[in-house]
């Protein structure tokens, strides 16, 4: 809860002008939902639905709220202390190695494989070999059985804030 974000924690493009060194870890910091004024004297509220800050900080600006892409649904809106939480629409998923877009889930498993996991907002359907029980690589098969996946279950967000 008492974590803090300072200018140095931000990516270069998010950093504001350098600030004087603080004499203690929490001196001159503003609460979540706020940023510090340029003279370092006041705390200014983030704008509801526009920007946010999640920790005690000495940021000169709040962080801009994420906008959900088309193909995503908004699970929870941006508040002054929490970024928007977006999730892939039903029938699509986001992989860890390609987080920039939602991909369509496969409609079924290749011949000789059975479905053991449904399409969820964060994973494709899961297929295993009937005999060996080993998982399929996840490539879209050339030939598909008529095993279809059930709708994705509501679940964890794909875009979480700290």
């Amino acid at each position: 809860e008492s974590a803090l974000i300072t200018q140095q924690d931000l990516a270069p493009q998010q950093r504001a002008a350098p600030q004087q060194k603080r004499s203690s870890p929490s001196e001159g910091l503003c609460p979540p939902g706020h940023h510090i004024s340029e003279d370092g004297r006041d705390c200014i509220s983030c704008k509801y639905g526009q920007d946010y800050s999640t920790h005690w900080n000495d940021l000169l600006f709040c962080l801009r709220c994420t906008r959900c892409d088309s193909g995503e649904v908004e699970l929870s809106p941006c508040t002054t202390t929490r970024n928007t939480v977006c999730q892939c629409e039903e029938g699509t998923f986001r992989e860890e190695d390609s987080p920039e877009m939602c991909r369509k889930c496969r409609t079924g498993c290749p011949r000789g494989m059975v479905k053991v996991g449904d399409c969820t907002p964060w994973s494709d359907i899961e297929c295993v070999h009937k005999e060996s029980g080993t998982k399929h690589s996840g490539e879209v098969p050339a030939v598909e059985e008529t095993v279809t996946s059930s709708p994705g279950t509501p679940a964890s967000p794909c875009s979480l804030s700290g």
């Epitope: 929490s26 509220s45 002054t80 202390t81």
Partner: antibody, heavy 119, light 107 residues
Framework: QVQLVQSGAEVKKPGASVKVSCKAS????????LHWVRQAPGQGLEWMGW????????KYNEKFKDRVTITADKSTSTVYMELSSLRSEDTAVYYC????????????WGQGTLVTVSS | DIQMTQSPSFLSASVGDRVTITCRAS??????VAWYQQKPGKAPKLLIY???TRHTGVPDRFSGSGSGTDFTLTISSLQPEDIATYYC?????????FGGGTKLEIK
């Protein structure tokens, strides 16, 4: 349930100091910011400053900065406000109030402590 | 510091009346305004925050609106228990400041 229980009324002479306490219960002490707000008789409300037990952050209203000291005892979940060099215009009801670590509005208030400054 | 100017400072109305209290900020405060109700000898109680969000347990006859510099608290149908003094507060920039109050009485 959330409770902020303040110390009793005080009568002080001009130039003296007063220390008012506010004991918090019914919630996690380190998750909320505690504030002091005062109200002179028949007057409006005036924010004096805050203390955040989670990181010991303190912020004062510049108007009171030279005379007010806010401290806390985490072992008893109590916050203190000491006001020095008292003058007659400091006669007021002093409230502690809390707010979540977010927008600066106050969702729970103590019952208030009347401080009278009179020679 | 931001000045919050409330009007009227005194208001007399009948039970069932629609009552409107206004608050003007000396500079843009976005929607960072809260409203409180205070009864004699008691601490203030939070009614509205973010200009229009009702606090938990507040009757829906209380509503708030506004953004920028002009804000309104409305009681759609005044009840005897609503007799109190009402304060606006800006929570946009420290020092957080309050309006001078509007004392509401029953005609």
């Amino acid at each position: 349930q959330v409770q902020l229980v303040q110390s009793g009324a005080e009568v002080k002479k001009p130039g003296a100091s007063v220390k008012v306490s506010c004991k918090a219960s019914g919630y996690t002490f380190t998750e909320y910011i505690l504030h002091w707000v005062r109200q002179a008789p028949g007057q409006g409300l005036e924010w004096m400053g805050w203390f955040y037990p989670g990181n010991n952050n303190i912020k004062y209203n510049e108007k009171f900065k030279d005379r007010v000291t806010i401290t806390a005892d985490k072992s008893t979940s109590t916050v203190y406000m000491e006001l020095s060099s008292l003058r007659s215009e400091d006669t007021a009801v002093y409230y502690c109030a809390r707010h979540e670590q977010g927008p600066g509005y106050f969702d729970y208030w103590g019952q208030g402590t009347l401080v009278t400054v009179s020679s | 510091d931001i000045q919050m100017t409330q009007s009227p400072s005194f208001l007399s109305a009948s039970v069932g009346d629609r009552v409107t209290i206004t608050c003007r900020a000396s500079q843009d405060v976005n929607t960072a305004v809260a409203w409180y109700q205070q009864k004699p000898g008691k601490a203030p109680k939070l009614l509205i925050y973010w200009a229009s969000t009702r606090h938990t347990g507040v009757p829906d006859r209380f509503s708030g609106s506004g953004s920028g510099t002009d804000f309104t608290l409305t009681i759609s149908s005044l009840q005897p228990e609503d007799i109190a003094t009402y304060y606006c507060q800006q929570h946009y920039i420290t020092p957080w400041t309050f309006g001078g109050g509007t004392k509401l009485e029953i005609k």
